[in-house]
Interface confidence: low
């Protein structure tokens, strides 16, 4: 964890007495002192002196003193090259350099894996001035190391726009294995092979993997990470996990459940949402999906009439939204309805059957064999018909509606008559002579008015001219004229 506390800026008691002109090359960092973490640029101070150029990682001084003695090349002193430590331990390392006092504007920065560490509260720079040189020690400390602290650390110093780079210090943080890929829960087909993957990393490497199924180890010998377990097939649900081992110990992955796909449970609670004469809207609650998504559902409909032939109508629909309108049903009929749904494994059993009824509808066919003739003696038109087949009445017949249209010399008027359900004939008064009368008849139930029959026309002559020939519509499929007695 990174805390934001700044170390006191006081010299470390590394060197007894006055500071020497150059640091020892085998200076070892203190590894166990707890230091604050966080990244901030270190504050640098140095005496202001005339500058000089340098090249590369070593600065070659060009200026000589009065005695013309050349100055030594500038370079960071060698320090510890590789630090190995356990996670959560503290670490401190440093780099040091002696800079002649003639140089000014010296700044030291810390870099990790090629990126500058900005904002490090735990980077401290100390200056130890002498008559001719200033010794500079830049310290870097981490209170509780994490894996993310692994890497190569260097110091860089800028003098008069030139750069000096230290040797790298490699930090290796070791800990328990860390999973980069864990097995995932799956729904699989019975007795079908599938793979599970487990990957963990150190350091320290290597990381070895053991697989565990239902609390028992699957492999006696460990496999190097990453490991793929091929399971030849399961017949029942199982829980798998993997163990990752390295020299620091053991980490166990999450346990994942492998489910066996099965056919779904049957839908429950089929409900009637709405009924009309020819359709029923149903809804249902899907059963358990058997660990495999529903694909579609089948609505099975059979007539509940014991005299029916027992045939089943099948309607297929999508699994959502658990709602279906069954169409093309007969009016005033009773039906048994069941629902079954399928996933990739197969069809569920059928839900409990429910009973549903369609309502009364308007008739679907017109009255048959409509015949019209003139009864001149009483100045009436006689109309006769046959009622539609009971199956096609779509309800209880309550009567008939007769439309008669009278057309003569540009005049046209339509009249409507209602007739009771028991009749199959009607008599209407002649409205206009020397005119054509067009008659159409429709059956009526409580569900509404059915279609009108094809028009039948009869000419009504002027008074004194008689035509006893009837006009009629033939019965469907019957080419012979209907004999009216």
């Amino acid at each position: 964890a990174i805390t934001e506390a700044r170390e006191e800026a006081k010299p470390y008691p590394l060197f007894p007495g006055p500071f020497p002109g150059s640091l020892q090359t085998d200076h070892t960092p203190l590894l166990s002192l707890p230091h604050a973490s966080g990244y901030q640029p270190a504050l640098m101070f140095s005496p202001t002196q005339p500058g000089r150029p340098h090249t590369g990682n070593v600065a070659i001084p060009q200026v000589t003193s009065v005695e013309s003695k050349p100055l030594p090349p500038l370079a960071f002193k060698h320090t510890v090259g590789h630090i190995i430590l356990s996670e959560h331990k503290g670490v401190k390392f440093n780099c040091s350099i002696s800079v002649p006092n003639i140089y000014q504007d010296t700044t030291i920065s810390w870099w990790k894996d090629g990126k500058e560490l900005l904002g490090a509260h735990h980077a401290i720079t100390q200056f130890y001035p002498d008559d001719e040189v200033t010794a500079i020690i830049a310290s870097f400390s981490i209170t509780s190391v994490q894996r993310s602290d692994n890497g190569s650390y260097i110091c860089k110093m800028k003098i008069n726009n030139e750069e000096i780079v230290s040797d790298p210090i490699y930090i290796e943080v070791q800990g328990l294995p860390h999973f980069t890929k864990q097995p995932e829960s799956m729904n699989v087909t019975r007795n079908t092979a599938f793979n599970l993957t487990c990957q963990a990393v150190g350091p320290p490497e290597p990381v070895n993997i053991f697989w565990v199924q239902n609390s028992s180890r699957v492999n006696e010998q460990p496999e190097k990470s990453p490991s793929v377990l091929t399971v030849p097939g399961l017949t029942e649900m199982a829980v798998f996990s993997c163990e990752a081992h390295n020299d620091k110990g053991l980490t166990v992955s999450k346990g994942v459940q492998i489910n066996i796909k099965a056919i779904p449970s049957p839908p429950t609670e089929v409900s009637i949402r709405n009924s009309t004469a020819h359709s029923i809207l149903i809804s249902w609650v899907p059963g358990f999906d058997g660990y495999s998504p529903f694909r579609n559902c089948s609505i099975q409909v059979k007539e509940a009439d014991p005299l029916s032939n027992g045939s089943v109508m099948i309607f297929n629909t999508s699994a959502l939204p658990h709602l279906y309108q069954i169409k093309q049903l007969q009016a005033l009929a009773n039906y048994s309805i069941g629902v079954s749904c399928m996933n990739e494994i197969g069809w569920s059993a059928v839900s409990p059957w429910i009973l549903a009824s369609t309502t009364e509808g308007a008739p679907s066919v017109a009255p048959l064999n409509v015949t019209v003739f003139l009864n001149e003696s009483s100045d009436n038109v006689d109309i006769r018909w046959m009622k539609p087949p009971t199956k096609q009445q779509d309800g209880e017949l309550v009567g008939y509606r007769i439309s008669h249209v009278w057309q003569s010399a540009g005049i046209s008027k339509e009249l409507l008559e209602e007739v009771g359900q028991n009749g199959s004939r009607a008599r209407i008064s002649v409205q206009v002579h020397n005119a054509t009368c067009t008659v159409r008849i429709a059956a009526v139930t409580r569900g509404g008015v059915g279609p009108f029959s094809d028009p039948v026309k009869i000419f009504i002559p002027a008074h004194g001219w008689v035509d006893y020939a009837p006009s009629s519509t033939p019965a469907p499929g019957n080419a012979d004229p209907v004999l009216i007695i």
Epitope: T268, E269, S271, R273, S283, V285, P321, H322, L323
Partner: antibody, heavy 120, light 108 residues
């Protein structure tokens, strides 16, 4: 999260009509019924009817048939309930609710209610 | 129409008491179709229990429901002050959907 937000309070004269709206969010509007329930002052809850937004299928309490009309606008996920020929005994808080009809039939989310006052 | 009759209409109870509210239906209802709601003053009703005994999301475990046929019960174990409300039963078996007349619970 699922929310049903209703329109504001209304004051109407007897014989007039009122149209209350209910905007749904946080779920797929066309998958669940919207029901309307009312509550007269100091009284219990009375179901008016439901509408299924996906196809506009409605079911009314016989008591309100012919006077209440439920509609939806799926483009805005909004349901509407219009009540005509208002009488003083229609004074009530009108709630829209989401109907969960899996095996019937409960109301899992409710709007905040719209107060309708009918007064001459 | 299925008529639901709740008992009692009103109850005044002290905290920590156990409360039982009953709801009687005029015809037999499958337990799947029976639900309870809680309505606090000036608030919308809130689903409390669905399908006779399932607690709705966020409902404390002191609430429970039971019943079958025509008789259903809502029980509150160890009543708390926040439970002061009116409780309604509801049937979803047939249209019109109907509610009980409500039971008002007052905390002494």
């Amino acid at each position: 999260q699922v929310q049903l937000v209703q329109s504001g309070a209304e004051v109407k004269k007897p014989g007039a009509s009122v149209k209350v709206s209910c905007k749904a969010s946080g779920y797929t509007f066309t998958t669940y019924d919207i029901n309307w329930v009312r509550q007269a002052p100091g009284q219990g809850l009375e179901w008016i009817g439901w509408i299924y937004p996906r196809d506009g299928y409605t079911k009314y309490n016989e008591k309100f048939k012919g006077r209440a009309t439920m509609t939806t606008d799926t483009s805005t996920s909004t349901a509407y309930m219009e009540l005509r020929s208002l009488r003083s005994d229609d004074t009530a808080v009108y709630f829209c609710t989401r109907g969960y009809y899996d095996n019937l039939y409960y109301f899992d989310y409710w709007g905040q209610g719209t107060t309708v006052t009918v007064s001459s | 129409e299925i008529v639901l009759t709740q008992s009692p209409d009103f109850q005044s109870v002290t905290p920590k008491e156990k409360v039982t509210i009953t709801c009687s239906a005029s015809s037999i209802i499958s337990s799947n179709y029976f639900h309870w709601y809680q309505q606090k003053p000036d608030q919308s009703p809130k689903l409390l229990i669905y399908r006779t005994s399932n607690l709705a999301s966020g409902v404390p475990s002191r609430f429970s429901g039971s019943g079958s046929g025509t008789d259903y019960t809502l029980t509150i174990n160890s009543l708390e002050a926040e439970d002061a409300a009116t409780y309604y039963c509801q049937q979803g078996r047939s249209v019109p959907l109907t509610f009980g007349q409500g039971t008002k619970l007052e905390i002494k």
